[in-house]
Interface confidence: low
């Protein structure tokens, strides 16, 4: 006869491990007992359990409540045991010694591998602002056994660096993703991908990039100078900019207060029917937590009663 077992049994932390030891014997052969022991190199054999054909199962005190026989019906030639709730300390070499009649004794070894799946964490770096140099966008850390693989999945251009810390029975891997912030990165996903044999599929943690910026301001509405004449209705100026965080807008008149009837609606300045009183220099002030921008325009309302031409100057300042 011969023993059938597995070279390696792999389980995930917390799962039950079936340690197989089956005697494939000739007709009429019987198994008297099967002794299970830890057989790690450099350590004395530590008994797990004894399966006896007559006396049943005896479990070593160190493994009380953790070793069982597989449920019935049981084959009398099957010396397999279940090790409940595998922990990292269970990883190692195991030996089954089978005493048979009349063929004598057989022994076999297997290695129990306990996978500890990682629980990855992603930590965003400092606030990203356009104009910064190479900056930490995020770091991702995962600890497991064996060491997990930590990579990044993103469309954003950047550089990665990894470091590993080995512990007695596991390893922690940290990967950092650095980039040069630009407004095009705003809203882009940056995904940490953790691979490990104890995971059914890769674990992914996604961080959405937020890059603070404020675009130059400009004013729209004065493109057709002939429209700005006395009596015209619906005239308006619109301040154009964009930013992250979204900016707020404020309108002022450089050469005095806003004329009565002029309405401020966020980025838009609405005029009542135009009069020459509406002529002047208007300033759009755009700001967010990152920066502020100004753009000013000169409005010259044309009075048809006068022959003088209308002039329009646009000035932008930061």
């Amino acid at each position: 006869g011969e023993l059938e077992t597995s070279d390696v049994v792999t389980v995930v932390l917390g799962q039950d491990a079936k340690l197989p030891c089956f005697y494939r014997g000739d007709s009429g052969e019987q198994v008297g007992q099967v002794a299970w022991a830890r057989a790690d190199a450099g350590e004395g054999a530590q008994e797990l359990a004894l399966l006896h054909s007559k006396y049943g199962l005896h479990v070593s005190p160190a493994y009380e409540g953790r070793v069982e026989q597989p449920p019935p019906p049981r084959n009398p030639l099957d010396g397999s045991v279940l090790l409940r709730n595998a922990v990292q300390a269970d990883e190692g070499e195991y030996e089954c010694r089978v005493s048979t009649f009349p063929a004598g004794s057989f022994q076999a070894r297997l290695r129990l591998r306990v996978l500890v799946p990682p629980l990855p964490s992603l930590n965003p770096g400092p606030a990203l602002e356009e104009g910064q140099g190479l900056t930490l966008a995020a770091s991702c850390t995962a600890e497991g056994s064996p060491a997990p693989s930590v990579t990044w999945d993103t469309e954003v251009k950047g550089t990665t660096s990894s470091r590993s810390f080995k512990h007695s029975r596991s390893a922690a891997v940290t990967s950092e993703f650095h980039l040069v912030p630009s407004r095009s990165m705003n809203g882009q996903p940056l995904t940490c991908v953790v691979s490990h044999p104890g995971l059914l599929q890769d674990q992914r943690i996604t961080h959405i990039l937020h890059v603070s910026f404020l675009a130059e301001a400009s004013v729209r509405g004065l493109e057709d100078q002939n429209l700005w004449h006395v009596g015209r209705e619906g005239a308006m100026l619109k301040c154009l900019s964009e930013g992250q965080p979204p900016p707020s807008y404020n309108w002022t008149r450089l050469d005095g207060p806003l004329p009565s009837g002029v309405r401020v609606d966020g980025d838009t300045l609405g005029f009542p029917p135009l009069t020459t009183e509406h002529s002047g220099i208007y300033v759009c002030h755009v700001s967010n937590e990152f920066s502020s921008r100004d753009s000013q325009v000169t409005v010259d309302v044309l009075d048809p009663q006068e022959d003088s031409g209308k002039q329009v100057d646009l000035v932008s300042a930061s």
Partner: antibody
Framework: EVQLVESGGGLVQPGGSLRLSCAAS????????MSWVRQAPGKGLEWVSA????????YYADSVKGRFTISRDNSKNTLYLQMNSLRAEDTAVYYC????????????????WGQGTLVTVSS | DIQMTQSPSSLSASVGDRVTITCRAS??????LAWYQQKPGKAPKLLIY???SLQSGVPSRFSGSGSGTDFTLTISSLQPEDFATYYC?????????FGQGTKVEIK
């Protein structure tokens, strides 16, 4: 893409023989245990036989033991079921399915199945 | 052999209903239990393995629970494509055995 394609089914008289084949692709065939599962018309699923990745271990349902033989050719990525002494009650759609060895004789659930081949045993 | 008993054998439900199917093993099988969906003329499709793990590509409305001898398959909100027959299977011992099936029909 994992694919399992059965063939060889057909009409056969009671007492006759038939050999089913299952062509596998899209995975490392020799790394997986393979099974045959059948389904009689209007009935449930019944496991028939299984074979380890190397072909060294075979398993049979009591209802087919001694009549059916499972085998595999890992060089051809093909699983076989030789069916002899066929009976009317063997009439069914026969599916091949793959499963992964966890440890010793403990396998995963069958994650991929073929489309099936119909075997009709009738005189 | 381990006997797998499924209940009910059939049920009628409407789209959006919560559906529960149970499976009992004649002896403890740890979590070596799978749930399959089968539509007429098609091969079985693996939905749940290891009693409660969702097979890749299967909608999250399917879930499994239980260990030892009692198991449950739940469809949280029945969809039109879910009308089919569902089977449980133990693969703890050889021979692996199936439940007799539960047919989910449109009410």
């Amino acid at each position: 893409e994992v694919q399992l394609v059965e063939s060889g089914g057909g009409l056969v008289q009671p007492g006759g023989s038939l050999r089913l084949s299952c062509a596998a692709s899209g995975f490392t065939f020799s790394s997986y245990a393979m099974s045959w599962v059948r389904q009689a018309p209007g009935k449930g699923l019944e496991w028939v036989s299984a074979i380890s990745g190397s072909g060294g271990s075979t398993y049979y349902a009591d209802s087919v033991k001694g009549r059916f033989t499972i085998s595999r050719d890992n060089s051809k990525n093909t699983l076989y079921l030789q069916m002899n002494s066929l009976r009317a009650e063997d009439t069914a759609v026969y599916y091949c399915a793959r499963a992964e060895l966890l440890a010793f004789d403990v396998y995963t659930a069958s994650d991929y199945w073929g489309q099936g081949t119909l075997v009709t045993v009738s005189s | 052999d381990i006997q797998m008993t499924q209940s009910p054998s059939s049920l009628s439900a409407s789209v959006g209903d919560r559906v529960t199917i149970t499976c009992r093993a004649s002896q403890g099988i740890s979590s070596y239990l799978a749930w399959y969906q089968q539509k007429p003329g098609k091969a079985p499709k693996l939905l749940i393995y290891a009693a409660s793990s969702l097979q890749s590509g299967v909608p999250s409305r399917f879930s499994g629970s239980g260990s030892g001898t009692d198991f449950t398959l739940t469809i949280s909100s029945l969809q039109p494509e879910d009308f089919a027959t569902y089977y449980c299977q133990q693969h703890y011992t050889t021979p692996p055995t199936f439940g007799q099936g539960t047919k989910v029909e449109i009410k």
